[in-house]
C-alpha cells in the first residue's frame, strides 16, 4: 500500500508524460489524478515506467473503477495488463476484438498466463461463441489454444470458424477434442472437391468414424503414415486390408515400421494373415488361416 502524503508544490501532474518516471511511488499516488490517468491511458505504454510505478497507477485506476475498468481504459493498458490479476479481469466486459488483440500483444511470445486465459474466457463468453475472427486472432497468438478447450467448450465453435484452423493448431488435441471438431470440419469443407477436401480435413481425421475412412479409401487420397497413426483405433479396426491399402496408397509400405504401434498393431491382429501377406510387407500377427473370427462386441450388442 502506497503511503498517502500531500503532493509537493509544483509536482501536480497536468498530463501523463515522461516526467512522471522520476516520481517516487508516493508522489505518483499523491500527484496523479485518477481521472486524468484514465483519459490519457493511451500514453502510459509509451512511457518507460517501472512495474513498481505501474502498480501505483493500477491502484489509482482500481479506486476510480471499483466495479471494473471500462473498455476505453482496458484497450490502452499495455504492460499495465501484466499487473492485473484474474480477479481484476473477471470484472471486465471486453467486447472489441481490437482490445483483445492489444492485450494479447503484450503477452506475445510467452505461454498463456492465467490473466490471458481469464481475458479470453471473458471475451468468448461475452460473444456467445468462438466466431471465425476471434479464433483467427487466438490461434495466431496461441497455436495450441483450440486444444486447450474442453470438448464442451469446443461445441460452441461454429463450423464456419473451422476455416481459420491451421494444422499446427491441432497438434496437441486429444481424440475427445477431435471427436467434436471433426464433424464441424466435415460440414465446413463439404462443398470442396476430393483432393482439396482431403488437404483441409486431414488434420481433423483423428475424430473420423470408420465409414468416413472407408469413403476416403475410395478417393485415392494417399494418406501419410503420420495421419494414419493419429486415427482412432476403433475407427481403424474394421477396415479391411484392401481399404487400408487404398487409403494409404504408396505410403502403405510405412506400415512395416509401425507394426508394433497402435493403431497398426491392433489392426494387424484383426486381419487374416493371408490378407496381410498380399501387401508383401512381411507383416506378422494376423489371424492364421482356418481360424474362425467371432466378433464378441457384436454378440453382446445383440443379447
Amino acid at each position: 500500500e502506497v503511503e498517502k502524503t500531500a503532493c509537493p508544490s509544483g509536482k501536480k501532474a497536468r498530463e501523463i508524460d515522461e516526467s512522471l518516471i522520476f516520481y517516487k511511488k508516493w508522489e505518483l499516488e499523491a500527484c496523479v489524478d485518477a481521472a486524468l490517468l484514465a483519459t490519457q491511458m493511451d500514453r502510459v505504454n509509451a512511457i518507460p515506467f517501472t512495474y513498481e510505478q505501474l502498480d501505483v497507477l493500477k491502484h489509482k485506476l482500481d479506486e476510480l473503477y471499483p466495479q471494473g475498468y471500462p473498455e476505453s481504459v482496458i484497450q490502452h493498458l499495455g504492460y499495465l495488463f501484466l499487473k492485473m490479476s484474474p480477479e481484476d479481469i473477471r470484472k471486465w466486459n471486453v467486447t472489441s476484438l481490437e482490445t483483445l488483440k492489444a492485450l494479447l500483444e503484450v503477452n506475445k511470445g510467452h505461454e498463456m498466463s492465467p490473466q490471458v486465459a481469464t481475458l479470453i474466457d471473458r471475451f468468448v463468453k461475452g460473444r456467445g461463441q468462438l466466431d471465425k475472427d476471434t479464433l483467427d486472432t487466438l490461434t495466431a497468438f496461441y497455436p495450441g489454444y483450440l486444444c486447450s478447450l474442453s470438448p464442451e467448450e469446443l461445441s460452441s465453435v461454429p463450423p464456419s470458424s473451422i476455416w481459420a484452423v491451421r494444422p499446427q493448431d491441432l497438434d496437441t488435441c486429444d481424440p475427445r477434442q477431435l471427436d467434436v471438431l471433426y464433424p464441424k470440419a466435415r460440414l465446413a469443407f463439404q462443398n470442396m472437391n476430393g483432393s482439396e477436401y482431403f488437404v483441409k480435413i486431414q488434420s481433423f481425421l483423428g475424430g473420423a468414424p470408420t465409414e468416413d475412412l472407408k469413403a476416403l479409401s475410395q478417393q485415392n487420397v494417399s494418406m501419410d503414415l503420420a495421419t494414419f497413426m493419429k486415427l482412432r483405433t476403433d475407427a481403424v479396426l474394421p477396415l479391411t486390408v484392401a481399404e487400408v491399402q487404398k487409403l494409404l496408397g504408396p505410403h502403405v509400405e510405412g506400415l512395416k515400421a509401425e507394426e508394433r504401434h497402435r493403431p497398426v498393431r491392433d489392426w494387424i491382429l484383426r486381419q487374416r494373415q493371408d490378407d496381410l501377406d498380399t501387401l508383401g510387407l512381411g507383416l506378422q500377427g494376423g489371424i492364421p488361416n482356418g481360424y474362425l473370427v467371432l466378433d464378441l462386441s457384436m454378440q453382446e450388442a445383440l443379447s
Epitope: P48, F49, T50, Y51, Y79
Partner: nanobody, 116 residues
Framework: QVQLQESGGGLVQPGGSLRLSCATS????????MGWFRQAPGEQRELVAR???????MYADSVKGRFTISRDNAKNTVLLQMNSLKPEDTAVYYC??????????WGQGTQVTVSS
C-alpha cells in the same frame, strides 16, 4: 535471470566525482532500457537517469548537467558518471530494468556518500 552488480561507490567530498558501473551477467531483454536509481535513508527509491534501448537518455531535473548515463555493449555494462556531487546525492545507488513479463530487477546497490 540476469544478475546486476553495481560498483564504484564510495565517500567523496562535495564537488567531487564518482563513476558507477553496473555489470550484467548476460544479455538483458528490457522493456524500458536500463536505469540508475537511488534510495536515501527513510525515502522511497527514485529514478536518477535512464538509457532506453534505442540509446535515448533521460535525467531527473536534480541531476541534469551533472550526471551522464552511458552504455558499453561490448562489456555488458551501464555507467553513471557523477560530477559536481552534492550532499543531497548521498544514497544507495541501484541499477535496474523491467522485463517484458511484469518484473523489475535490481542490483544489490552501492553506497555513495557526499560529505566533507
Amino acid at each position: 535471470q540476469v544478475q546486476l552488480q553495481e560498483s564504484g561507490g564510495g565517500l567523496v567530498q562535495p564537488g567531487g566525482s564518482l563513476r558507477l558501473s553496473c555489470a550484467t551477467s548476460g544479455t538483458i531483454f528490457s522493456r524500458n532500457g536500463m536505469g540508475w536509481f537511488r534510495q536515501a535513508p527513510g525515502e522511497q527509491r527514485e529514478l536518477v537517469a535512464r538509457i532506453l534501448n534505442d540509446g535515448t537518455t533521460m535525467y531527473a531535473d536534480s541531476v541534469k548537467g551533472r550526471f551522464t548515463i552511458s552504455r558499453d555493449n561490448a562489456k555488458n555494462t551501464v555507467l553513471l558518471q557523477m560530477n559536481s556531487l552534492k550532499p543531497e546525492d548521498t544514497a544507495v545507488y541501484y541499477c535496474g530494468y523491467s522485463d517484458y513479463r511484469g518484473t523489475d530487477y535490481w542490483g544489490q546497490g552501492t553506497q555513495v556518500t557526499v560529505s566533507s
